[in-house]
């Protein structure tokens, strides 16, 4: 998977009036990394691993960047015409990636009330709009404002692309997130289901990177997809991931079932506790 840095900012309006402040989260390699603390007006690391990325350096730069981006987004929301009464949101998601072949990608996406209406490839400066008429109207509105804004010149988009990649490389240089491997802890539990059946659940936690194979096997053969239930692979807040898989089996046949896990070239098999 590529290394990635993802900025997620949201601003709100009420009855056409843009609210002060903004919400901001930053994800590094898919993990919650920073958030903007509105009480302290500071960028705050999310967990110990995030603190370790910058070590003893301050988060002033991140605070300044998020504050500036929040201000820009509030100005953009103010220029959206025909805001109906009530609560509305404008969200900007900006992502940059560095792939294994060193190629890079960066893009910017705008959502109004949760609906995507405008995307831009920051490297090539190509703008894309979904086909709905609402998206087209919003996109023209926002795009015209961005065009008018002197800061949003062509060099500005190149700068956004370059800045995001520069920050991502800076974080990767710490070595904390760089192609590390943390093997999962695997835990199998059982619980009563209907009469004569039990549900067996296999949980993998605290692993990195996020790619993992977790599946139930009967007599050494993987069960079909539709007889198993999978949980999403989710960040656990410590810079690692967690997931689970469950299936229903007949009581008394526990010894025939094993949970198979494969992660970063290593694999293991885990029996059902009896």
């Amino acid at each position: 998977e590529p290394h990635s840095l993802r900025y997620n900012l949201t601003v709100l309006s009420w009855d056409g009036s843009v609210q002060s402040g903004f919400l901001a989260e930053v994800h590094l390699d898919g993990q919650p990394f920073l958030r903007y603390d509105r009480q302290k007006c500071r960028a705050k690391p999310q967990g110990q691993w995030a603190e370790d990325v910058l070590g003893n350096k301050t988060w002033d730069r991140e605070t300044r960047d998020l504050t500036g981006n929040g201000k820009d987004l509030r100005m953009t929301l103010a220029h959206i015409k025909d805001q109906k009464e009530g609560l509305h949101s404008l969200q900007e998601i900006r992502v940059c990636e560095i792939h294994e072949d060193n190629s890079t990608r960066s893009s910017q996406h705008f959502y109004y009330d949760g609906e995507l209406f405008l995307s831009q490839n920051l490297e090539t400066e190509e703008w894309t709009v979904p086909q709905s008429s609402r998206a087209q109207t919003l996109a023209m509105n926002v795009r015209n404002f961005l065009k008018e804004d002197a800061m949003k010149t062509k060099t500005h988009y190149h700068a956004m692309h370059a800045d995001c990649l520069q920050e991502l490389r800076r974080y990767l240089e710490s070595g904390v997130v760089l192609r590390r491997t943390v093997p999962p802890m695997v835990n199998v539990t059982r619980s009563e289901a209907s009469e004569g059946n039990i549900t067996v659940t296999c949980r993998a936690s605290s692993f990195y990177p996020r790619n993992i194979i977790l599946t139930w096997r009967q007599d050494g053969v993987s069960l079909s997809h539709d007889t198993q239930q999978w949980g999403d692979v989710l960040p656990d807040g410590n810079g690692t991931y967690q997931t689970w898989v469950a299936t229903r089996i007949c009581r008394g046949e526990e010894q025939r079932f094993t949970c198979y896990m494969e992660h970063s070239g290593n694999h293991s098999t885990h029996p059902v506790p009896s």
């Epitope: 490297e123 090539t124 190509e126 062509k154 060099t155």
Partner: antibody, heavy 120, light 106 residues
């Protein structure tokens, strides 16, 4: 209406250089990037690079970077591509194509192509 | 660079037949674009941003896909659809094109 008029076919010797042109009309020349695409006889399309006429900024496909130079003349709204140290590998049709802003604009407008033949 | 692999390289279809051309990318891309080219002419933008039809393109054409797998489909083949079709990505530099699919009419 938008038009991209490319220069006539070129016959060149190996080791020589050629400079072909793409004359743009029907739109604001400095508002859109100009891309160049290569097509060898009976083969597929290869993106060479682009130039931003407003700033002169260029982006090249690494494969073509050493022997290709893209330039523009804003006063005549013309984009140029020069190929140097020609070999038989450069024998191809070269197209200019206009970049865009919105996705709907990109690569809609193409020149008719300039055929370059490299032969001793 | 991102490599786009088109299949099939050559195919023929009867009038009224459904045709699907696929384009596989070596890494995930946001949008795929398709061009039609007939002998002796410049390429024409045919489908852009994965699924949007360029101006003048008949509604029997459609595009779909995401990530590394994309396709162009003709619901009912017509004689005028005989041409070479190229996929293209613009996710990052360098832009690349697929090797092309030559579609012939039976």
């Amino acid at each position: 209406q938008v038009q991209l008029q490319q220069s006539a076919a070129e016959l060149a010797r190996p080791g020589a250089s050629v400079k072909m042109s793409c004359k743009a009309s029907g739109y604001t020349f400095t508002s859109y990037t100009m891309h160049w695409v290569k097509q060898r006889p009976g083969q597929g399309l290869e993106w060479i690079g682009y130039i931003n006429p407003s700033s002169g900024y260029t982006e090249y496909n690494q494969k073509f970077k050493d022997k290709t130079t893209l330039t523009v003349d804003k006063s005549s709204t013309t984009s140029y591509m020069q190929l140097s140290s020609l070999t038989s590998d450069n024998s191809a049709v070269y197209y200019c194509a206009r970049g865009g802003d919105w996705d709907v604009d990109w690569f809609v407008y193409w020149g008719q192509g300039t055929l370059v033949t490299v032969s001793a | 660079q991102i490599v786009l692999t088109q299949s099939p390289a050559i195919m023929s279809a009867s009038p009224g037949e459904k045709v699907t051309i696929t384009c596989s990318a070596s890494s995930s891309i946001s949008y795929m674009h398709w061009f039609q080219q007939k002998p002796g002419t410049s390429p024409k933008l045919w489908i852009y941003s994965t699924s949007k039809l360029a101006s003048g393109v008949p509604a029997r054409f459609s595009g779909s896909g995401s990530g590394t797998s994309h396709s162009l489909t003709i619901s009912r083949m017509e004689a005028e659809d005989a041409a070479t079709y190229y996929c293209q990505h613009r996710s990052t530099y360098p832009f690349t094109f697929g090797s092309g699919t030559k579609l012939e009419i039976k």
